[in-house]
């Protein structure tokens, strides 16, 4: 996990001192590298990456997605709304990252690293968002039942779910990275 604290980050008068922008940037890129490795194994193991039947599996998922209203795109950018969305989205992805833990053979450690690095990233971002409105945390009971439901799927759906989680998480992180660079 990339370390570092940048004392040059100074908050505007109504903000607390920030955690390092570099640390956040490096952390996201580190996670993206991990996702690439996991996607490689997934795509080599099955033909999910070329499948046109993604919609079937997507019905069972409620993966976080960036929308115009979230304020993270160049059009309609709103830094505070966006930062809340990024943190909320990452918290929502945690259950899906837990699901991925037993889905890899040769990349088991990589899957764990992605999960742990995401937890660290959330902590960095929560420090940056210290004075923003309270961020809602997913309900643990709902997450537990979702995890059970996902694990009970047939093999084909589990493979497709794995592929969709990795693809969606990659897209979410890429959008987050672009937006955070402005902050």
């Amino acid at each position: 996990v990339p370390p570092g604290e940048d004392s040059k980050d100074v908050a505007a008068p109504h903000r607390q001192p920030l955690t390092s922008s570099e640390r956040i940037d490096k952390q996201i890129r580190y996670i993206l590298d991990g996702i690439s490795a996991l996607r490689k194994e997934t795509c080599n193991k099955s033909n999910m990456c070329e499948s046109s039947k993604e919609a079937l599996a997507e019905n069972n998922l409620n993966l976080p997605k960036m929308a115009e209203k979230d304020g993270c795109f160049q059009s309609g950018f709103n830094e505070e709304t966006c930062l809340v969305k990024i943190i909320t989205g990452l918290l929502e992805f945690e259950v899906y990252l837990e699901y991925l833990q037993n889905r890899f053979e040769s990349s088991e450690e990589q899957a764990r690293a992605v999960q742990m690095s995401t937890k660290v990233l959330i902590q960095f971002l929560q420090k940056k968002a210290k004075n923003l409105d309270a961020i809602t945390t997913p309900d643990p009971t709902t997450n537990a039942s979702l995890l059970t439901k996902l694990q009970a799927q047939n093999q084909w759906l589990q493979d497709m779910t794995t592929h969709l989680i990795l693809r969606s998480f990659k897209e979410f992180l890429q959008s987050s990275l672009r937006a955070l660079r402005q902050m």
Partner: antibody
Amino acid sequence: EVQLVESGGGLVQPGGSLRLSCAASGFTFSPFAMSWVRQAPGKGLEWVAKISPGGSWTYYSDTVTGRFTFSLDTSKSTAYLQMNSLRAEDTAVYYCARQLWGYYALDIWGQGTLVTVSS
Amino acid sequence: DIQLTQSPSSLSASVGDRVTITCSASISVSYMFWYQQKPGKAPKLLIYDMSNLASGVPSRFSGSGSGTDFTLTISSLQPEDFATYYCMQWSGYPYTFGQGTKVEIK
């Protein structure tokens, strides 16, 4: 045409204050972070400060922290650099620059405004 | 802060020459950028994120490198390329610049 126009430079005594303005036109100001970069006469470039698009986060170089304040008026598409306790070594051409969306590059620069600190 | 050292500090070249400017960082950097500045003018972005060509910049300009060592190459020097070139890095704040390389007519 996408452009940034700085103003407010001039001659000021050591210990004095000055406020620089940077007026943006030709693009939607609201999604972009802005920076100030300065260049002492005959010298190289030195980054001074950055402000996030909504003004929530600011970053300063050690040389100006506590003396300079970066602010925005998004309704006027204008950025400001309030410079207090000015020193002779602050003498420079001050450029405002826009940060390329999604990257850290500074892609659009103004023509600069000269600040001279001298008694 | 991260120090950037450019070499050479100045060079003389002819139109059509291949010109290479290097930028060495005191520690590994996250992102490197290259700028061109002409006397009395603002800097102009040429390259961002090590090797991406900025909008409107001719393809004779290219950037390469990673870690601590970076290069700006002008494949065939044109009359309008005589200027001072600066590398700039971002690895958290502050951004820092190299001291500049002046490209003069031989």
